[in-house]
């Protein structure tokens, strides 16, 4: 039994880090493998993660972690019974994938303006709370080509657009994701999408 693709891990910078790897053949990850992880400092405890299958030869482990600080560094040991398959380390602050934003809502009652709001996925005292920027994806359910991305580079979790920038009388969906430039994070997963029917008053044309 050998590791084909070494574990790569990302942290949500709050409570979970997720590590994924591939074995050299079909593996029952939960019965055959264990990932041990330990914060590097004196008297720290070793924790055991039981991996789950992620495709035939793929394994995934969710490592529970206390509130992350930038100095945190973990040793990782992947075991198959008594055999050490791989040894590595992981610094959560250097491999951050933010949590996905939540509660995406489209407010359609503001004078031909669409107001999209969502919730910051972090509590106020978390370091990422004030460092997230967002991308909002809006697309038409009727027309796959009607697909647009709005970059929200300010901290406020909201976006205003004129309803008239979208077609009237059809349904649209929106979703949002986040990233933090300060930690050079990857993008979060997309939030669940929300749907609305776009309609607005056409401006009165004078002849």
């Amino acid at each position: 039994m050998k590791v084909l693709q070494e574990p790569t891990c990302v942290s949500d910078y709050m409570s979970i880090s997720t590590c994924e790897w591939k074995m050299n053949g079909p593996t029952n990850c939960s019965t055959e493998l264990r990932l041990l992880y330990q914060l590097v400092f004196l008297l720290s405890e070793a924790h055991t993660c039981i991996p789950e299958n992620n495709g035939g030869a793929g394994c995934v482990c969710h490592l529970l972690m206390d509130d992350v600080v930038s100095a945190d560094n973990y040793t990782l040991d992947l075991w198959a019974g008594q055999q050490l398959l791989w040894k590595g380390s992981f610094k959560p602050s250097e491999h951050v994938k933010p949590r996905a934003p939540g509660n995406l809502t489209v407010h359609t009652n503001v004078s031909d303006t669409l107001l999209l709001t969502w919730s910051n996925p972090y509590p106020p005292r978390n370091y990422l709370y004030n460092h997230l920027t967002y991308a909002v994806n809006i697309w038409s359910e009727n027309d796959p080509a009607d697909f647009r991305i709005y970059n929200v580079t300010y901290l406020e979790p909201s976006l205003r657009i004129a309803a008239s920038t979208l077609k009237s009388g059809i349904s649209y969906r929106a979703r949002v994701r986040a990233w933090a430039q300060c930690y050079n994070t990857t993008w979060s997963e997309w939030s669940p999408s929300t749907k609305w029917h776009n309609s607005y008053r056409e401006p009165f044309e004078q002849h």
């Epitope: 979970i16 969710h62 206390d66 509130d67 949590r99 509660n103 978390n126 370091y127």
Partner: antibody
Framework: QVQLVESGGGLVQPGGSLRLSCVAS????????MNWVRQAPGKGLEWVSY????????YYADSVKGRFTISRDNAKNSLYLQMNSLRDEDTAVYYC????????WGQGTLVTVSS | DIQMTQSPSAMSASVGDRVTITCRAS??????LAWFQQKPGKVPTRLIY???SLQSGVPSRFSGSGSGTEFTLTISSLQPEDFATYYC?????????FGQGTKVEIK
């Protein structure tokens, strides 16, 4: 081995105050965020409060906000819950529980609020 | 605040039965869900975290599934020591909230 021992519970009248303590051993307390969780007699679990190891951030359940204060003294390996303006509905066994996500619990201390 | 609704609140089952407990969140919590077991007079112990990750030392007859708002705890073959009360917990956001509990009793 990890141990959490709560104390400070007892009988108190409505409107009164009580301070609970939780002494930790078997791990580096200063490196762990901590929680208080309570359980009214015959009822379910209710999270009460959290204090971060990293930022000192504190969070409270709506039911205790403004009345309870969580704090810690890393030099004494101790977690505290100052409970003021106590009400009948605060009667419960109070547990301290360690992060991440309540991996270790103390045995609890009973707080009875009654006139 | 996020509400967690567990069902059923109580159930009777026999040794060897397959038992399923569900937990519904009032809004999306991704996989930030844990399951705890509490026996009478004892402190709770964590069985599952991150919706489906088995806590080390917990028997493999326990499993968790779900994401978003719908979650399930399954005991594949109920053992005598499994008669207890089970709670779900969301830690996606503060305040953290537990489900009201499911008591699994002997039929």
């Amino acid at each position: 081995q990890v141990q959490l021992v709560e104390s400070g519970g007892g009988l108190v009248q409505p409107g009164g105050s009580l301070r609970l303590s939780c002494v930790a051993s078997g791990f580096t307390f200063s490196h762990s965020s901590m929680n208080w969780v309570r359980q009214a007699p015959g009822k379910g679990l209710e999270w009460v409060s959290y204090i971060s190891r990293a930022t000192g951030a504190v969070y409270y359940a709506d039911s205790v906000k403004g009345r309870f204060t969580i704090s810690r003294d890393n030099a004494k390996n101790s977690l505290y819950l100052q409970m003021n303006s106590l009400r009948d509905e605060d009667t419960a066994v109070y547990y301290c529980a360690r992060e991440p996500v309540f991996d270790y619990w103390g045995q609890g201390t009973l707080v009875t609020v009654s006139s | 605040d996020i509400q967690m609704t567990q069902s059923p609140s109580a159930m009777s089952a026999s040794v060897g039965d397959r038992v399923t407990i569900t937990c519904r969140a009032s809004q999306d919590i991704s996989n930030y869900l844990a399951w705890f077991q509490q026996k009478p007079g004892k402190v709770p112990t964590r069985l599952i975290y991150a919706a489906s990750s088995l806590q080390s030392g917990v028997p493999s007859r326990f499993s968790g599934s779900g994401s978003g708002t719908e979650f399930t705890l399954t005991i594949s073959s109920l053992q005598p020591e499994d008669f207890a009360t089970y709670y779900c917990l969301q830690w996606s956001s503060y305040p953290r909230t537990f489900g009201q509990g499911t008591k699994v009793e002997i039929k």
